[in-house]
């Protein structure tokens, strides 16, 4: 018999490399049975996780799983860091593993490496 506990499916040590200026959606996969739990996102600051109160979030429902999405509109360089989602379910608090965003800030076209440089050292774009 399948468990009806709420489960948050963020993999341990998951990470995303993203670019400043782009839109991005950070997904928290949530499995539940009857009533959808109340889910929040927080950002790790040392040992505490600061709740993200005023950020745009949404739900995406799929057949066997739902996703609680944190929207970055757009990604800013200071969005770099680790995030965690938490679910409140029947007075229980369930916390996910943390997921880390590595944000690269590409400054301007004048700093873009040449095609030759890119061919030999493609990581230059992400300095």
């Amino acid at each position: 018999k399948e468990s009806c506990d709420v489960q948050l499916y963020i993999k341990r040590q998951s990470e995303h490399s993203i670019l400043a200026g782009d839109p991005f959606e950070l997904e928290c996969p949530v499995k539940y049975c009857a009533n959808r739990p109340h889910v929040t996102w927080c950002k790790l600051n040392g040992t505490t996780c600061v709740k993200l109160e005023d950020r745009q979030t949404s739900w995406k429902e799929e057949k066997n799983i739902s996703f609680f999405i944190l929207h970055f509109e757009p990604v800013l360089p200071n969005d770099n860091g680790s995030y965690r989602c938490s679910a409140n379910f029947q007075s229980n608090l369930i916390e996910s593993h943390s997921t880390t965003l590595y944000v690269t800030d590409v400054k301007s076209a004048s700093e873009r490496p040449s095609k030759d440089e890119m061919a030999s050292r493609p990581w230059l774009l992400y300095r």
Epitope: G21, D22, P23, E73, P74, T104, D105, K107, A109, L125
Partner: antibody, heavy 119, light 107 residues
Framework: QITLKESGPTLVKPTQTLTLTCTFS??????????VGWIRQPPGKALEWLAL???????RYSPSLKSRLTITKDTSKNQVVLTMTNMDPVDTATYYC???????????WGQGTLVTVSS | DIQMTQSPSSVSASVGDRVTITCRAS??????LAWYQQKPGKAPKLLIY???GLQSGVPSRFSGSGSGTDFTLTISSLQPEDFATYYC?????????FGPGTKVDIK
């Protein structure tokens, strides 16, 4: 070097649909961090951001005009097309195509094309 | 949407003058602000990005400062080619918004 050029009608009638094409060179819209956008400027007035297509395929629009705007890219032709439905005389403006890399500052601009909406 | 305001709306100055233009955001935008220069009949040109970063090819007499809600563009010694309209733009969040512009003309 990076260049962008706008093309399309200079005169459209009210209620018609405007289609503007931005043809660019010197970069690819499939390169990480790149975006191509549209900004307009009514005569004697300030700049207004309309839409932006990102290298990822994501698109963002000005909320006040979202229902009327569509931005599409043709990476193989190095073109981005903006369509704007239900044109009105208040949409009379110079329309600029712009390039961005990284954070959303517009570092290269086309020369602009003046679109007049009149019957 | 974040509203951007600029002051003054116009300024009359002479060659060699120091000119300061301010831009204010209706909410905090950290340092995600750009400044553009526009001459009549021409497209805008990016001068400053990230509040204080000088765009390549822009003369060093242009400088930007500020963070949060209050920003400044300074032209240390006005040159004849600097007579133009200047706009600020926030890049902190969609939709990107511009200030109403500041016209710098000859005294």
């Amino acid at each position: 070097q990076i260049t962008l050029k706008e093309s399309g009608p200079t005169l459209v009638k009210p209620t018609q649909t405007l289609t503007l094409t931005c043809t660019f060179s010197g970069f690819s819209l499939s390169t990480p961090a790149v975006g191509v956008g549209w900004i307009r400027q009514p005569p004697g007035k300030a700049l207004e951001w309309l839409a932006l297509e990102f290298w990822t395929g994501d698109k963002r629009y000005s909320p006040s005009l979202k229902s009327r705007l569509t931005i599409t890219k043709d990476t193989s032709k190095n073109q981005v097309v903006l369509t704007m439905t239900n044109m009105d005389p208040v949409d009379t403006a110079t329309y600029y195509c712009t390039h961005k890399l990284g954070m959303n500052y517009f570092d290269y601009w086309g020369q602009g094309t003046l679109v007049t909406v009149s019957s | 949407d974040i509203q951007m305001t600029q002051s003054p709306s116009s300024v009359s100055a002479s060659v060699g003058d120091r000119v300061t233009i301010t831009c204010r955001a209706s909410q905090g935008i950290s340092s995600w602000l750009a400044w553009y220069q526009q001459k009549p009949g021409k497209a805008p040109k990016l001068l400053i990005y990230a509040a204080s970063g000088l765009q390549s090819g822009v003369p060093s007499r242009f400088s930007g400062s500020g963070s949060g809600t209050d920003f400044t563009l300074t032209i240390s010694s006005l040159q004849p080619e600097d007579f133009a309209t200047y706009y600020c733009q926030q890049a902190n969040s969609f939709p990107f918004t511009f200030g109403p512009g500041t016209k710098v003309d000859i005294k």
